[in-house]
């Protein structure tokens, strides 16, 4: 006869491990008992359980309520046992010793491998700002047994580097993603992908990139010269910029206070019916937490009654 078993039994943490040991013998042979032992390089061989054909399953107190026979129907030649709720400390070598009649004793050893699936965590790097050099965008750490694989999935151009730390029963892997921040990266997803034999599918954690920037400011509204004549209504100046975080706008007049009746509404400066009093240099000040920009324009309101004056519109930033 011979024993049918496995060299390696692999189970995920918390699952039940079936330790197989089946005696394949002649029809007239019988199994008297199957003794299971844990083989420890330091502590030697320690009995785990004994499965006796007459006296039933005996379990070592250290494994009480954790070792069982597989559910019926059971073959009398099957000495397999179930180790409930596998933990990392269960990982190691096991031995089954089968006492048969009349063939004698047979033994086999197997290794129990307990997979510990990782629980990854993603940590964003310092705030990203346009104009910085190569900067840490995010790091992703996963610890498991065996060591997990940590990679990045993104359309963003960057570099990734990994390092691992080995512990007695697991390994922690940290991968960092570095990039040169630009405004085009704003809102782009950066996904950490963790692979491991204990996971049915990859674990993914997505971080949305935020890159702080502030665009140059410019003013629109002076394109149509006919709008800037005495008596005209609805004249506006609009300050154009964009940024992250979204910028705030402030309007001032360089050569004095804003004329009465001029209304500031965010990025837009609205004028009442125009008079020559509205002529002057107007400054749009754009700012966010990162930076500030200015753009100024010179407005000259033409009086159609004064043919000596031409409309002179000058814009400068």
């Amino acid at each position: 006869g011979e024993l049918e078993t496995s060299d390696v039994v692999t189970v995920v943490l918390g699952q039940d491990a079936k330790l197989p040991c089946f005696y394949r013998g002649d029809p007239d042979e019988q199994v008297g008992q199957v003794a299971w032992a844990r083989v420890d390089p330091n502590e030697g061989i320690r009995e785990l359980a004994l499965l006796h054909s007459k006296y039933g399953l005996h379990v070592n107190p250290a494994y009480e309520d954790r070792v069982e026979q597989p559910p019926p129907p059971r073959d009398p030649l099957d000495g397999s046992v179930l180790l409930r709720n596998a933990v990392q400390a269960d990982e190691g070598e096991y031995e089954c010793r089968v006492s048969t009649f009349p063939a004698g004793s047979f033994q086999a050893r197997m290794r129990l491998r307990v997979l510990v699936p990782p629980l990854p965590s993603l940590n964003p790097g310092p705030p990203l700002e346009e104009g910085q050099g190569l900067t840490l965008a995010a790091s992703c750490t996963a610890e498991g047994s065996p060591a997990p694989s940590v990679t990045w999935d993104t359309e963003v151009k960057g570099t990734q580097s990994s390092r691992s730390f080995t512990h007695p029963r697991s390994a922690a892997v940290t991968s960092e993603f570095h990039l040169v921040p630009s405004r085009s990266m704003n809102g782009q997803p950066l996904t950490c992908v963790v692979s491991h034999p204990g996971l049915l599918q990859d674990r993914r954690i997505t971080h949305t990139l935020q890159v702080a920037f502030l665009a140059e400011a410019s003013v629109r509204g002076l394109e149509d010269q006919n709008l800037w004549q005495v008596g005209r209504e609805g004249a506006t100046l609009k300050c154009l910029s964009e940024g992250q975080p979204p910028p705030k706008y402030n309007w001032t007049r360089l050569d004095g206070p804003l004329p009465s009746g001029v209304r500031v509404k965010g990025d837009t400066l609205g004028f009442p019916p125009l008079t020559t009093e509205h002529s002057g240099v107007y400054v749009c000040h754009v700012s966010n937490e990162l930076s500030s920009r200015d753009s100024q324009v010179t407005v000259e309101v033409l009086d159609p009654e004064d043919p000596g004056k031409q409309v002179d519109l000058v814009s400068a930033s």
Epitope: G32, Q33, A35, E47, L50, Y55, V59, N60, P61, S99
Partner: nanobody, 117 residues
Framework: EVQLVESGGGLVQAGGFLRLSCAAS????????MGWYRQAPGKQRELVAG???????RLADSVKGRFTISRDNAKNTVYLQMNSLKPEDTAVYYC???????????WGQGTQVTVSS
Amino acid sequence: EVQLVESGGGLVQAGGFLRLSCAASRSVFRINVMGWYRQAPGKQRELVAGITSGGSRRLADSVKGRFTISRDNAKNTVYLQMNSLKPEDTAVYYCFAEAVVGDEPYWGQGTQVTVSS
């Protein structure tokens, strides 16, 4: 041959306790399986508890949480601690020892346990 001598039986009220001892004439460390069967009047003999040379144990479902089996290798003795005894535990308790796997077990002479309500 292994001689087994039991002691510790007696009459006890329900809820009480007894400790049975089974002294073997040779090292219990070398005995494959030792333990206790019981037989109540008019009933079949049933396995109550067992302990292996490697220290693994078995208790019948009917006594789990109430009985414990242990052994003292130095004294070549196996013990059955019986707590929270019930009238249905009344029986003759027999110590057994299977010296080598597959061999017929050796038996003690039996000790009477009576639990009164």
